[in-house]
């Protein structure tokens, strides 16, 4: 039975421009995270695997970077990046957990500073 | 850090049997597959046996199915590689390999690479 | 039994230089495919897994391409720590298959 939960920064905005942080947590299982994917629509943009470590991307490795922890920071955002982003644990024995997250990229400086994990 | 020791390794002659085991430290055994790879002397890889996290399932090389067992202890954090009816061919470095899993999105299953590796014990069949 | 075929057996080549190996397996593998490095006296190292991944700690002048049936490992620049034996590995079906390596000399 999944008993998990998965915490997301939810909705957030940043700034054209600037740089964010995608964060997601699972809590409530004792489950072992065995590799995280982060995907925007239907694209993957990386993975945390625990044993094997981070791959991003070739199309964004110039502007996505790993963590913190399993976290992914966006980096240069455009107004193409507003959209919706998933985090996808695959756990043992649990299974799959997905997370949402949305967010808008804003082109002058009426972007939202308050939001948990973003980086100013 | 994961660490892995072989041993059990020798001499023997042909038709005769000898166990290798392998002492696993540095992670959860029981949650990882495990594998025995061997190299005879200046050759390649050959993958030997895999088995399962729990030992419910194991997989064998055509070149010694029948002939080796592979099985674990994991209240012992041990892997095993039962060996009998040797054969001179079956000379060869033996290396115990843990597993690590890779889930690919795009087929929806799980891969197993071999990331981390004992350093080995020499099996010599020999009359 | 999927037979992976490793060319060219030995690769001359000098400090700085790049190498180009090939892999190339008798079906498809989608992308179910490491290399490994061996040194002599040394246990296999994972270098690449699914095709294209590099494994922890594996510095980024190793880079591996292909899915399918042909796959390349490349070493941007060669270092003196990486004239050793590169094995590919299909780990898409059981029985799983090593190839037959190919030895990166000094020339």
């Known amino acids: 039975m999944m008993t998990g939960t998965i915490e997301t920064t939810g909705n957030i905005s940043a700034e054209k421009g600037g740089s964010i942080i995608l964060q997601c947590h699972l809590s409530s299982t004792t489950a072992q995270v065995t590799q995280v994917n982060w995907e925007q629509q239907d694209q993957l943009l990386a993975i945390c695997n625990a044993d094997l470590g981070w791959h991003i991307s070739p199309s964004f490795k110039d502007r996505v970077a790993p963590g913190p922890g399993l976290g992914l920071t966006l980096q240069s955002l455009t107004v193409n990046d507003t959209g919706e982003y998933f985090c996808i644990y695959h756990t043992y024995p649990d299974g799959t957990y997905t997370g949402r997250i949305f967010l808008e990229v804003l082109e002058s400086s009426v972007a939202e500073h308050g939001a948990r994990f973003q980086i100013p | 850090e994961v660490q892995l020791v072989e041993s059990g390794g020798g001499v023997v002659q042909p038709g005769r049997s000898l166990r290798l085991s392998c002492a696993a430290s540095?992670?959860?055994?029981?949650?990882?597959?495990m594998v025995w790879v061997r190299q005879a002397p200046g050759k390649g890889l050959e993958w030997v046996a895999s088995?399962?996290?729990?030992?419910?399932?194991?997989y064998y090389a055509d070149s010694v199915k029948g002939r080796f067992t592979v099985s674990r202890d994991n209240s012992k954090n041990t892997l095993y590689l039962q060996m009998n009816s040797l054969r001179a061919e079956d000379t060869a470095v033996y290396y115990c390999?843990?597993?690590?899993?890779?889930?690919?999105?795009?087929?929806?299953?799980?891969?197993?690479?071999?990331?981390?590796w004992g350093q080995g014990t020499l099996v010599t069949v020999s009359s | 039994e999927i037979v992976l075929t490793q060319s060219p057996a030995t690769l001359s080549l000098s400090p700085g230089e790049r190498a180009t190996l090939s892999c190339r397996a008798s079906?498809?593998?989608?992308?179910?495919l490491a290399w490994y490095q061996q040194k002599p006296g040394q246990a296999p190292r994972l270098l690449i897994y699914?095709?294209?991944k590099r494994a922890t700690g594996i510095p980024a002048r190793f880079s591996g391409s292909g899915s399918g049936t042909d796959f390349t490992l490349t070493i941007s620049s060669l270092e003196p720590e990486d004239f050793a034996v590169y094995y590919c590995?299909?780990?898409?079906?059981?029985?799983?298959?090593f190839g037959g390596g190919t030895k990166v000399e000094i020339k």
């Open positions: 699914d095709a294209s």
């Open positions: 390999a843990r597993v690590s899993y890779y889930y690919d999105s795009v087929e929806l299953r799980w891969a197993e690479y071999f990331q981390h």
């Open positions: 590995q299909q780990v898409h079906n059981f029985p799983l298959t």
């Open positions: 079906q498809s593998v989608s992308s179910y």
């Open positions: 540095g992670f959860t055994f029981e949650s990882y597959g």
């Open positions: 088995i399962l996290y729990d030992g419910s399932n194991r």
